[in-house]
């Protein structure tokens, strides 16, 4: 069965700024990623940013920095400053299509008491919901 | 309700320039991605251009160098500069909203662009 | 670029008959497609979104199918106000590109 992990981090560097990593373990060729925080994209989660392997990255404040790690991972940087700046108990969340399979999604959140530049390693989330 | 209204067509001479406006309402600009497409007399449809909702812009080959699409969030407003015009450019021009990536779902009414001596 | 071949260019149809229309990709789009019907003088107007999805408010007699490089449009029971040009819109990869256009005319 596919999952996705979820990896948030704080930067050190910038105590308000956070890198989330996605993966997508399954077999299936990617179609689209969409990144939320506040919960899961369409359940009152708020898009950060919209990856397609062909056309291209979307993102939106606060996001600074979306890319492709792999074909079956994301990274995206969060900026840390101003009123839509996440906190240390935000939720992330990433759900990643691939055709024809279907739909795949789970949430993380910076890990309780971690210390700045340190995160949990990537082991899959929970699997929220596949469509 | 959502809305799209172009303005700006006209007749223009060959090598002449035009811009295009397209005011939009009813829907949170910012969020979307905007095209413009085009329609030659009793011709088919063309994709002309997009721009994402950071500015990030593409464009049908034979329009890269003379066409230049631009957005004002602010202003809930979509442009397209039109230089170097030519015959084959005259269309109906349509101003298109997307939810990126999936696909055209609104459009405006059109605005008559004429490249003619 | 992705072509996109639109089969038949027109036909004739009458009132409740069932009506198919095919376009067919140059490479595989997934079901990154659109149907598009437009009337004379108006903008065009969605009809199905990703490939099989009805737009909201459009009559369920419509349905798309496919996936890959083969899609099909449907109109189960032809209305009178269904006569119009109908377009396949590919939204995988730039450029973006139209089928042809089928015209369906009555008979």
């Known amino acids: 069965t596919p999952e996705v992990w979820v990896q948030v981090r704080m930067e050190a560097t910038e105590l308000s700024s956070f890198t989330i990593r996605c993966g997508f373990l399954g077999s299936g060729s990617i179609s689209l990623v969409t990144v939320s925080w506040g919960g899961p994209n369409g359940a009152g989660g708020t898009t950060l940013a919209v990856l397609h392997p062909e056309r291209g990255i979307r993102q939106w404040a606060p996001a600074r920095q979306a890319r492709w790690e792999t074909q079956s991972s994301i990274s995206l940087i969060l900026e840390g400053s101003g009123a839509s700046s996440p906190c240390a108990n935000t939720t992330f969340c990433c759900k990643f299509a691939s055709f024809p399979e279907g739909s795949w999604e789970a949430c993380g959140s910076l890990p309780p008491s971690s210390d700045p530049g340190l995160s949990a390693p990537p082991t899959p989330a929970p699997i929220l919901r596949a469509d | 309700e959502v809305q799209l209204v172009e303005s700006g067509g006209g007749l223009v001479q060959p090598g002449g320039s035009l811009r295009l406006s397209c005011a939009a309402s009813?829907?949170?600009?910012?969020?979307?991605?905007m095209h413009w497409v085009r329609q030659a007399p009793g011709k088919g449809l063309e994709w002309v251009s997009d721009i994402g909702n950071s500015g990030e812009t593409y464009y049908l080959g034979s329009v890269k160098g003379r066409f230049t699409i631009s957005r004002e969030n602010a202003k809930n407003s979509l442009y397209l500069q039109m230089n170097s015009l030519r015959a084959g450019d005259t269309a109906v021009y349509y101003c298109?909203?997307?939810?990126?990536?999936?696909?055209?779902?609104?459009w405006g009414q059109g605005t008559t662009v004429t490249v003619s001596s | 670029d992705i072509q996109m071949t639109q089969s038949p260019s027109s036909l004739s149809a009458s009132v409740g008959d069932r009506v198919t229309i095919t376009c067919r990709a140059s490479q595989g789009i997934r079901n990154d497609l659109g149907w598009y019907q437009q009337k004379p003088g108006k903008a065009p107007k969605r009809l199905i979104y990703a490939a099989s999805s009805l737009q909201s408010g459009v009559p369920s007699r419509f349905s798309g199918s496919g996936s890959g490089t083969e899609f099909t449009l449907t109109i189960s029971s032809l209305q009178p106000e269904d006569f119009a040009t109908y377009y396949c819109l590919q939204h995988n990869s730039y450029p973006l590109t139209f089928g042809g256009g089928t015209k369906v005319e009555i008979k």
């Open positions: 009813g829907f949170t600009f910012r969020n979307y991605d």
């Open positions: 298109v909203r997307e939810e990126f990536p999936h696909g055209m779902d609104v």
